[in-house]
């Protein structure tokens, strides 16, 4: 590989799992990788296949436990691995120290559906996912409304600067098809990251009431 | 402003052994790999291995594995190289680097962002 061309970012999701990418330009495609996982305080240790995402990136996800198992805590420290093969032995192509809770990436909000819809307004709640109860109340959710005409880019993005699983659209313009998404961050980190964006929540308002004259 | 000084050089005799150091100041220390370089008479500067910034994880060059160890003290900020089975080939100048971030990679040894004046470790009978 070409010097100075390596990247190596994992994530936690807070409860069990750690999703790593991998990308080095120049490597060959079919090169065997994996990252390992060794927590410094625990008894388990935990490996990954690296699998090509893109000419020049490979990802994994290391399955610590049940998905809403708290496999790691604020001051646990992960050494994480890359290993390539070379040939009959595995070589260390990359090494850190991983503080899950300092990179963090939770998982897309889950269940979003319609609780009242009106004319102009729509309520919509949702669920977090597979996060953990450390955060208590310190996340913050962004969420966009894709209107007709428009793409996601340039939907508004509306901040929940607390822990609030629903939000209250207006201004919208009656029997009209939208569609709303919502991601969600913890205010702990120091490299975490939002989470993915949800599924998007197709929903349609109401037809304005006919005058009565009409 | 980031200052790192090496010390612990000298003369020795092939087989022998040796202890350097670094210390290091005007940065936060434990958030950083570390690497030693060294540079022998009329050659380039050659990589001899690293270490990620909470001491966990060490990667060394071919040449000096399982004969030198890189350990770290972030209590001291300091960094060490202990060098066993000393031969006239580690004969070079030792530097001691602070790397771009707390993540090491082997295809980038020489990402370094400063660098020591290093010391002079010469093997020979």
């Known amino acids: 590989a070409v010097n100075g061309t390596s990247q190596f970012t994992c994530f936690y999701n807070s409860r069990a799992n750690i999703s790593c990418v991998w990308s080095q330009d120049g490597a060959l495609q079919d090169t065997s990788c994996q990252v390992h996982a060794w927590p410094d305080r625990r008894r388990w240790n935990q490996t990954c296949e690296l699998l090509p995402v893109s000419q020049a990136s490979w990802a994994c996800n290391l399955i610590l436990g049940a998905p809403d198992s708290q496999k790691l805590t604020t001051v646990d420290i992960v050494t994480l691995r890359v290993l390539c093969r070379e040939g009959v032995r595995w070589r260390v192509m990359a090494i850190q120290d991983f503080k899950p809770f300092e990179n963090l990436r939770l998982m897309a909000p889950i269940s979003l559906q319609v609780v009242h819809v009106e004319t102009h307004r729509c309520n919509i709640s949702w669920e977090i996912s597979q996060a953990s109860h450390y955060f208590e109340r310190h996340l913050e959710f962004e969420a966009r409304t894709l209107s007709p005409g428009h793409t996601w880019e340039e939907a508004p993005l509306l901040t929940l600067k607390q822990k609030q699983e629903w939000i209250c659209l207006e201004t919208l313009t009656p029997d009209t098809q939208y569609e709303f998404q919502v991601r969600v961050k913890p205010l702990q980190g120091e490299f975490t990251t939002w989470s993915p964006w949800s599924q998007p929540l197709a929903f349609r308002t109401k037809p304005a009431a006919l005058g009565k004259d009409t | 402003e980031v200052q790192l000084v090496e010390s612990g050089g000298g003369l020795v005799q092939p087989g022998g052994s040796l202890r350097l150091s670094c210390a290091a100041s005007?940065?936060?220390?434990?958030?950083?790999?570390m690497s030693w370089v060294r540079q022998a008479p009329g050659k380039g500067l050659e990589w001899v291995g690293g270490?990620?910034?909470?001491?966990?994880?060490?990667i060394y060059q071919d040449s000096v594995e399982g004969r030198f160890t890189i350990s770290r003290n972030n209590a001291k900020n300091t960094l060490y190289l202990q060098m066993n089975s000393l031969r006239s080939e580690d004969t070079a100048v030792y530097y001691c680097?602070?790397?771009?971030?707390?993540?090491?990679?082997?295809?980038?040894?020489?990402?370094?962002?400063?660098r020591g004046q290093g010391t002079q470790v010469t093997v020979s009978s």
């Open positions: 270490i990620t910034g909470e001491g966990l994880g060490t």
């Open positions: 680097t602070k790397m771009a971030s707390g993540t090491l990679f082997r295809d980038k040894p020489y990402e370094y962002t400063s």
């Open positions: 005007g940065f936060t220390f434990r958030n950083y790999a």
